[in-house]
C-alpha cells in the first residue's frame, strides 16, 4: 500500500504513513490555477453510472509554500484538495431543464482525504541562517465517505465495500501546533 506516485522536484518522496484521514486545510480563496483530476479513478458521470464503486470526487491539485518561522520552502509543494459531489445512484428528475439532482433526503456523502504522503521539504531561511528541513503531510488521494442517520454526524462511514474492512493500526495525527502558531504554516501559492 504505497502512496500514489507523486513527483515534486523540490522535495523527497517518503512512503506511506498509514494514518486516519483528516480534512485538508481550508483554502483562503479560490483563485487557483489548478486542474481537477480523478487521480486514476473512473470519471464521475452521475447521470449514467449505476455502480457505486464508480463514483469518485474531484481531486484538485493546488500548490502551497511550507513555512517554518522565518524560513520558507524554495519551491511550493503540490497536493490535493478533495472537492466535488459524491452520492448514491438515486437520481431524481429536475423540474428545471433535463438535468438530474441528488435526492436531498438521501445519506450525506462527503469527499474527504483518503491517503496521505509525507515529504521532506528543504526550507531556506533569511539572513544567512543555514537551510532547514521539515516533514509535511500532504493529501495524496480522496474518497467518498458517508454520514448515516444511525451515527453521530461527526462519524464518517466508508462509501462502498471498504466500509466493512477495519482499518488496522491507524492513528490520528497529532495536532502539535495551534492554527495561530502552526508548526508548518501554510501559504497558498496562486
Amino acid at each position: 500500500q504505497g502512496w500514489q506516485a507523486f513527483k515534486n522536484d523540490a522535495t523527497e518522496i517518503i512512503p506511506e504513513l498509514g494514518e486516519y484521514p483528516e480534512p485538508p486545510p481550508e483554502l483562503e480563496n479560490n483563485k487557483t490555477m489548478n486542474r481537477a483530476e480523478n487521480g486514476g479513478r473512473p470519471p464521475h458521470h452521475p447521470f449514467e453510472t449505476k455502480d457505486v464503486s464508480e463514483y469518485s470526487c474531484r481531486e484538485l491539485h493546488f500548490t502551497r509554500y511550507v513555512t517554518d518561522g522565518p524560513c520558507r520552502s524554495a519551491k511550493p509543494v503540490t497536493e490535493l484538495v478533495c472537492s466535488g459531489q459524491c452520492g448514491p445512484a438515486r437520481l431524481l428528475p429536475n423540474a428545471i431543464g433535463r438535468g438530474k439532482w441528488w435526492r436531498p433526503s438521501g445519506p450525506d456523502f462527503r469527499c474527504i482525504p483518503d491517503r496521505y504522503r509525507a515529504q521532506r521539504v528543504q526550507l531556506l531561511c533569511p539572513g544567512g541562517e543555514a537551510p532547514r528541513a521539515r516533514k509535511v503531510r500532504l493529501v495524496a488521494s480522496c474518497k467518498c465517505k458517508r454520514l448515516t442517520r444511525f451515527h453521530n454526524q461527526s462519524e464518517l462511514k466508508d462509501f462502498g465495500t471498504e466500509a466493512a474492512r477495519p482499518q488496522k493500526g491507524r492513528k490520528p495525527r497529532p495536532r502539535a501546533r495551534s492554527a495561530k502558531a502552526n508548526q508548518a504554516e501554510l501559504e497558498n501559492a496562486y
Partner: antibody, heavy 119, light 107 residues
Framework: EVQLQQSGAELVRPGALVKLSCKAS????????MHWVKQRPEQGLEWIGR????????IYDPKFQGKASITTDTSSNTAYLQLSSLTSEDTAVYYC????????????WGQGTLVTVSS | DIVMTQSHKFMSTSVGDRVTITCKAS??????VAWYQQKPGQSPKLLIY???TRHTGVPDRFTGSGSGTDFTLTISNVQSEDLADYFC?????????FGAGTKLELK
C-alpha cells in the same frame, strides 16, 4: 491522544549496556524526527542525537558518538536508545522527544527513563 | 558547538511579580531558540519556539523575545504553578544545545 511511552527504570552494572525504548502512539514516527535527551540528577539537558525513522539517517552529538546508538522499528512505531560501556556518568534520566523540523525544538517528550549505573 | 548561557541559576520571585529569564548564545542563532518549563519529576514542556511563538495552550503571561545572541523569557503576573526550572535551547545548528537552566523560586 499523542503519547511517547518509555520503558521502565534500569539498574545496571558498570561496563554493561542497556537498551531503552520509546513507543509512540497517536502519530506515526515516520512523520517526524525522533530525538533522545539526557538529564543527569539536578543538572541540565544534553541532546544525544536524532534519527529520521523513514530512512534511518542519524545525527549524534559528537560527545555521545560510540556511547549511544539510536535505532527505530517502524513496524512497532518505536524508537530505541542503546547505551554501552556504562559508567556512573551515564546515571541519568533519558527522554525521547520528537518534532517535524530538522533541526528543531521538541514539541512532545516521553516521561523519561531513569538509568542507574551502580556496582 | 553553540553554548547557551543562562546567567542566573536561581531567580527569586513573588506571586504576581514579573520576572525575566535571560539566555545568551555563543554565536548568532537568529531566532532559532525554544524555551521549556520543567517541574520536579516531570519531563520538560515546550513553552516558546522561534524565540517568540507561544506553543499551543501556553498562557499568554509567558512571552519570549530576542534574536541573534540575546534571548529572554518573561513571565508576567507569576503564578505559584510557574515555579519550576526553565531551559533555553538553540536549534540553529547541530548539535542542539541547551542552557544550564534557571530555577524560579519563591522569595
Amino acid at each position: 491522544e499523542v503519547q511517547l511511552q518509555q520503558s521502565g527504570a534500569e539498574l545496571v552494572r558498570p561496563g554493561a549496556l542497556v537498551k531503552l525504548s520509546c513507543k509512540a502512539s497517536g502519530f506515526n514516527i515516520k512523520d517526524y524526527y525522533m530525538h533522545w535527551v539526557k538529564q543527569r540528577p539536578e543538572q541540565g539537558l544534553e541532546w544525544i542525537g536524532r534519527i529520521d525513522p523513514e530512512n534511518g539517517d542519524i545525527i549524534y552529538d559528537p560527545k555521545f558518538q560510540g556511547k549511544a546508538s539510536i535505532t527505530t522499528d517502524t513496524s512497532s512505531n518505536t524508537a530505541y536508545l542503546q547505551l554501552s560501556s556504562l559508567t556512573s556518568e551515564d546515571t541519568a534520566v533519558y527522554y525521547c522527544a520528537y518534532d517535524a523540523g530538522d533541526p528543531a525544538w521538541f514539541t512532545y517528550w516521553g516521561q523519561g527513563t531513569l538509568v542507574t549505573v551502580s556496582s | 558547538d553553540i553554548v547557551m548561557t543562562q546567567s542566573h541559576k536561581f531567580m527569586s520571585t513573588s506571586v504576581g511579580d514579573r520576572v525575566t529569564i535571560t539566555c545568551k548564545a555563543s554565536q548568532d542563532v537568529f531566532t532559532a531558540v525554544a524555551w521549556y518549563q520543567q517541574k520536579p519529576g516531570q519531563s520538560p514542556k515546550l513553552l516558546i519556539y522561534w524565540a517568540s511563538t507561544r506553543h499551543t495552550g501556553v498562557p499568554d503571561r509567558f512571552t519570549g523575545s530576542g534574536s541573534g545572541t540575546d534571548f529572554t523569557l518573561t513571565i508576567s503576573n507569576v503564578q505559584s504553578e510557574d515555579l519550576a526550572d526553565y531551559f533555553c535551547q538553540q536549534y540553529s545548528s547541530y548539535p542542539l544545545t541547551f542552557g544550564a537552566g534557571t530555577k524560579l523560586e519563591l522569595k
